[in-house]
């Protein structure tokens, strides 16, 4: 591994950059560490405020974590010649609050993108599609990691955060080849209708540690390749028949439902019956009731219809706001 800031082998590159020569294809940017053998560049925890312009053409894996990038403009990674090998880009924890349309254009091999732990007050609808055409060129992205990108309340613009993220996921139908999508820890209360229908290749979907209160309008029907669906640590109270049937109809799926505040009243009967016979839910023996009080901590699999009656009103603590 060579480092521009410490290795003598990089001195000529620094000199050539200073004399305004075009960047050499295999130089290492200042404040970064580079390994041509591993095709990897790491510019980590260096308080960078913009993406280095002189990235080596060989870069396949680029780590720009722990910086202070603030804004990713259109063409943030566009170079002449292009970074044609760049396949994995990690921008997590870099204090990004704005990702503009076309930020990832001209990266023809980009398969994995991690924007986690950035407080994104603005995510352009065209961040991943690159254009505002109703059908864009397919994105090469296969894995998109967007955990904990929710901004603090005072930085949210006057818009639904769920809607902003969804718009970027469906724009131009560019992400039809996406296999993995992580959206954990984003305070989502809901998924806008039809978002998943436009991501038909998904194999892994992580919605854990959100505040989802219902899946009634979420259609899983098109996700025939889905293998893992993570819904742990949400605010789900019951899954209704339509959802149960859709999940059961997915040939390969494993669903994770731990740590939701299940309401064990008469409306839970269908879900309990389904749980007892399905192989879809992982760790189903761990699912317990949260409400009503008299049912707290009862195991769902151990309930029968006589246990599931309807009291008129549930306590205010059931609410999610």
């Amino acid at each position: 591994t060579s480092s521009a800031s410490s290795s003598s082998s990089s001195a000529p590159f620094l000199a050539s950059a200073a004399s305004a020569q075009p960047p050499l294809p295999d130089q290492c940017p200042a404040l970064c560490e580079c390994s041509e053998a591993a095709r990897t560049v790491k510019c980590v925890n260096r308080n960078l405020t913009e993406v280095p312009t002189d990235l080596p053409l060989y870069v396949r894996n680029l780590f720009l974590t722990g910086n202070q990038l603030a804004v990713l403009p259109a063409g943030a990674f566009a170079r002449r010649p292009p970074l044609a090998e760049l396949a994995a880009l990690n921008l997590s924890g870099s204090r990004l609050d704005e990702v503009r349309g076309g930020a990832f254009e001209h990266l023809p091999s980009l398969r994995q993108l991690d924007l986690s732990h950035n407080p994104l007050a603005y995510l352009s609808p065209f961040a991943f599609s690159g254009s505002n055409a109703s059908i864009s060129a397919p994105s090469p992205l296969v894995e998109l990691i967007l955990n904990h990108i929710v901004p603090p309340d005072d930085k949210r613009q006057n818009r639904s955060f769920e809607g902003m993220v969804a718009a970027a996921l469906v724009a131009g139908r560019a992400l039809q080849g996406l296999h993995l999508l992580e959206l954990a820890s984003n305070h989502f209360l809901y998924l806008p209708r039809d978002v998943l229908a436009q991501l038909p290749s998904l194999r892994y979907l992580d919605l854990s540690n959100n505040s989802l209160v219902s899946l009634t309008y979420v259609s899983f029907r098109n996700l025939t390749h889905l293998e893992s669906l993570h819904l742990e640590d949400n605010a789900l109270k019951v899954l209704h028949n339509g959802t149960l049937a859709e999940l059961q109809g997915l040939p390969h799926v494993r669903v994770f439902l731990d740590n939701n505040p299940w309401v064990c009243d008469c409306h839970m009967a269908d879900m309990v019956t389904w749980l007892k016979q399905t192989g879809v839910v992982q760790g189903k023996d761990r699912l317990t009731c949260a409400f009503p009080e008299k049912m707290r901590n009862r195991v769902l699999l151990e309930l029968n219809s006589a246990d599931l009656d309807c009291d008129p009103i549930l306590p205010p603590s059931l609410q999610t706001s």
Partner: antibody, heavy 118, light 107 residues
Framework: QVQLQQSGPEVVKPGASVKISCKAS????????MNWVKQSRGKSLEWIGD????????NYNQKFKGKATLTVDKSSSTAYMELRSLTSEDSAVYYC???????????WGQGTSVTVSS | NIVMTQTPKFLLVSAGDRVTITCKAS??????VAWYQQKPGQSPKLLIY???NRSIGVPDRFTGSGYGTDFTFTISTVQAEDLAVYFC?????????FGGGTRLEMK
């Protein structure tokens, strides 16, 4: 910012038809269902139906099937509702409303008054 | 169709009062309830969705609670600008239906 601009008031004769428009701006039109709601004078709200602008799929309140037809023009980001065989019972203010959280309507047009009178 | 029965129809209030409106669904609508405010001559405005979640920009004096068939909407401290008609709506099953409305008027 999100805006829904509806067409102006209509005064029509019984038996006639009318087509109301709702032009959307400030968001991606195809990303959200559009709802239509009726409010008769001094009365509550009645949901007529919704349309998915992405594919034109519709879902009607049975009460308004045959009365209302919902369509969209994606190229102009405009939703339309046609009301046919009008009677005095159809006199009302009609709203288009964008869906936000599923089912709930987070932005509304200013309303279009339809008066059926001979 | 699910019927949403909203009470009371009218409420006479003074500034600073606490106001509670209830809505009862004819069958369970889970947590799929929204509340709207309509001021005179204006379009309705979404205040609360999924029972208890405030829409963007809605003051925290507006709250909602309930589950299943019984729902409550509360204004903790009424202000003059809150004079309006308030509607509940179930979005659990089509056709989506509204309550009859509650008119808030100043004493």
């Amino acid at each position: 910012q999100v805006q829904l601009q509806q067409s102006g008031p209509e005064v029509v004769k019984p038996g006639a038809s009318v087509k109301i428009s709702c032009k959307a701006s400030g968001y991606t039109f195809t990303d959200y269902y559009m709802n239509w709601v009726k409010q008769s004078r001094g009365k509550s709200l009645e949901w007529i139906g919704d349309i998915n602008p992405n594919n034109g799929g519709t879902n009607y309140n049975q009460k308004f099937k045959g009365k209302a037809t919902l369509t969209v023009d994606k190229s102009s980001s405009t939703a339309y509702m046609e009301l046919r065989s009008l009677t005095s019972e159809d006199s009302a203010v009609y709203y288009c409303a964008k869906e936000g959280p599923p089912g709930a309507m987070d932005y509304w047009g200013q309303g279009t008054s339809v008066t059926v009178s001979s | 169709n699910i019927v949403m029965t909203q009470t009371p129809k009218f409420l006479l209030v003074s500034a600073g009062d606490r106001v509670t409106i209830t809505c009862k669904a004819s069958q369970s609508v889970s947590n799929h309830v929204a509340w709207y405010q309509q001021k005179p001559g204006q379009s309705p405005k979404l205040l609360i969705y999924y029972v208890s979640n405030r829409s963007i920009g809605v003051p925290d004096r507006f709250t909602g609670s309930g589950y299943g068939t019984d729902f409550t909407f509360t204004i903790s401290t009424v202000q003059a600008e809150d004079l309006a008609v308030y509607f509940c709506q179930q979005v659990y099953s089509s056709p989506f239906t509204f309550g009859g409305g509650t008119r808030l008027e100043m004493k």
